[in-house]
Interface confidence: medium
Amino acid sequence: FRNDKCGDTIKIESPGYLTSPGYPHSYHPSEKCEWLIQAPDPYQRIMINFNPHFDLEDRDCKYDYVEVFDGENENGHFRGKFCGKIAPPPVVSSGPFLFIKFVSDYETHGAGFSIRYEIFKRGPECSQNYTTPSGVIKSPGFPEKYPNSLECTYIVFVPKMSEIILEFESFDLEPDSNPPGGMFCRYDRLEIWDGFPDVGPHIGRYCGQKTPGRIRSSSGILSMVFYTDSAIAKEGFSANYSVLQSSVSEDFK
C-alpha cells in the first residue's frame, strides 16, 4: 500500500509506504504535510525506513525538512529533523504512534522522500536492521524450530556504492512440493530484495532445503522477509553477510 497524500492518519494493517507528494519527481513549494502513523494495538511499536532516494533542499534544514516525533503529535519525543540527500536512519517508536511532519518553503525543491512503515515485531530476533560491516542473520530461535505465523523483516544498510554479500550456512524451511522446483513457496518462505522489500529488484523466493546461492546486492540495502504459516515448522536459516568495499571501515565510522 502506498500513501502519497499530503498528510493522513494511517492505521497500519500491513506494511506500506508514505511519500512526499510528487515523489520521486518533485515536491511543491510551501507544503506542510503531517502524517500520524498508528499501530493497531497499544502495545505494538512502529518501524520506519527511508528509501535511499532521499532529496530535500539542504540548507541546515531551515527551509525544507522532514521531522519525526515519537508520539501522537509534535509534543512527542523528537527523533530528528532531516534534509539533504542522505536518507535518515531507521526509526522505531517506543509506543503505538509516530508523527511525521514535512515542510517545504517557497522555492528550491528536490525529489522528496519515501518512507516504508510497518509494525515492529517484538518476537525474538524478528524484524531487525543491520548497519555493521558484517554480521549474522538468523531466523527466530535458530537452530530450534521457528515459530508459526511470523512476518520478520531483516534489512541490511551499508554505505552507498558498497556491495553486500550474503551467504547461507544453514537453510531449512517447510517445502512446497507441488509446483515445479517449489517456486511458489506457499507455506513458509524467505523473500530477498536488492533494496527495500517490494521496492528493490526481487532477488528470489526460497523454501525447502534448497539453500539460496551466494547473494549479492549493490544498492546499499539488502532486505529479507521471512514468512511462516500456522503449521509445520523447521529449523530455519542462518546467514552471514559482509560488505565489499576497500574503505568500508571509514564509511561505517
Epitope: 497524500k5 499530503c6 507528494p21 510528487g22 520521486p24 519527481h25 518533485s26 511543491h28 535511499p52 525529489a111
Partner: antibody, heavy 119, light 107 residues
Framework: EVQLVESGGGLVQPGGSLRLSCAAS????????ISWVRQAPGKGLEWVSS????????YYADSVKGRFTISADTSKNTAYLQMNSLRAEDTAVYYC????????????WGQGTLVTVSS | DIQMTQSPSSLSASVGDRVTITCRAS??????LAWYQQKPGKAPKLLIY???SRASGVPSRFSGSGSGTDFTLTISSLQPEDFATYYC?????????FGQGTKVEIK
C-alpha cells in the same frame, strides 16, 4: 539551447529488442530526471519510465516492467531505454522528456522516435 | 493507479471563443497537475504546471485552475495556433498518468 534528441527507433519483430537513446544538450543529466513517454498511433500519451539524475533511481509503468530498462550515462549526457521482448502493442512514437527542476512538469521534449513492432 | 478523465474528448470552436477543458482525477492529487498541448506530428509542449502556473513563454490566454480532483484549462480567446490536442497529467504519484486528450478543432 536546451535540447533532447532521440534516436534508435525502427522496425523490429515481436520478441525482438531495441535500444533508444536520448542525447541532451544545454543541461546536465546529473541534476534533472528524465522520462520516456510513448504515443501509439492515433492514441494518447503514456508514461513509460523515469530515471532520477545522479543517483539513477528508476521507475516503470506496469506495462513495461521487467521488459524495459532505463539508464543514463552522465558522462555522455545521454539516457537510454533498452526494450526487450517487444510486443505489437509497444508500437509507438517514443519521446524522452526532461522533468524540470524549477518547473513541475515535463518542460523539454525530444522530437520522438518511431518504434514499430511487426512481423 | 490514479486515473485521469478529460472532457470533452473533442470540441469545435471558432477563433476568439472562450474554451474550457476539464480534467478529473480518480483521487485527490492536490495541485500536482500539468497541462500539455500537442500538435499533429509534434512533441507535446508544457503549458501549465502545479494546476495553475504558466510555463515559460506560454501566452496569458492560457490559464489553469482547480485542486484536489477537479481541474480546468481555459483558453480565454482562441487563436488559430491553439487548434491542437490538450492533455492533463497527474504527477502526484508513480505511475504518472495522462488524461485521454481533448481535441480542439476549428468550427
Amino acid at each position: 539551447e536546451v535540447q533532447l534528441v532521440e534516436s534508435g527507433g525502427g522496425l523490429v519483430q515481436p520478441g525482438g529488442s531495441l535500444r533508444l537513446s536520448c542525447a541532451a544538450s544545454g543541461f546536465s543529466f546529473s541534476s534533472e530526471p528524465i522520462s520516456w513517454v510513448r504515443q501509439a498511433p492515433g492514441k494518447g500519451l503514456e508514461w513509460v519510465s523515469s530515471i532520477t539524475g545522479k543517483n539513477g533511481y528508476t521507475y516503470y509503468a506496469d506495462s513495461v516492467k521487467g521488459r524495459f530498462t532505463i539508464s543514463a550515462d552522465t558522462s555522455k549526457n545521454t539516457a537510454y531505454l533498452q526494450m526487450n521482448s517487444l510486443r505489437a502493442e509497444d508500437t509507438a512514437v517514443y519521446y524522452c522528456a526532461r522533468w524540470g527542476k524549477k518547473v513541475y512538469g515535463m518542460d523539454v521534449w525530444g522530437q520522438g522516435t518511431l518504434v514499430t513492432v511487426s512481423s | 493507479d490514479i486515473q485521469m478523465t478529460q472532457s470533452p474528448s473533442s470540441l469545435s470552436a471558432s477563433v476568439g471563443d472562450r474554451v474550457t477543458i476539464t480534467c478529473r482525477a480518480s483521487q485527490s492529487i492536490s495541485s500536482y497537475l500539468a497541462w500539455y498541448q500537442q500538435k499533429p506530428g509534434k512533441a507535446p509542449k508544457l503549458l501549465i504546471y502545479g494546476a495553475s502556473s504558466r510555463a515559460s513563454g506560454v501566452p496569458s490566454r492560457f490559464s489553469g485552475s482547480g485542486s484536489g480532483t477537479d481541474f480546468t484549462l481555459t483558453i480565454s480567446s482562441l487563436q488559430p495556433e491553439d487548434f491542437a490536442t490538450y492533455y492533463c497529467q497527474q504527477y502526484m504519484s508513480v505511475p504518472i498518468t495522462f488524461g485521454q486528450g481533448t481535441k480542439v478543432e476549428i468550427k
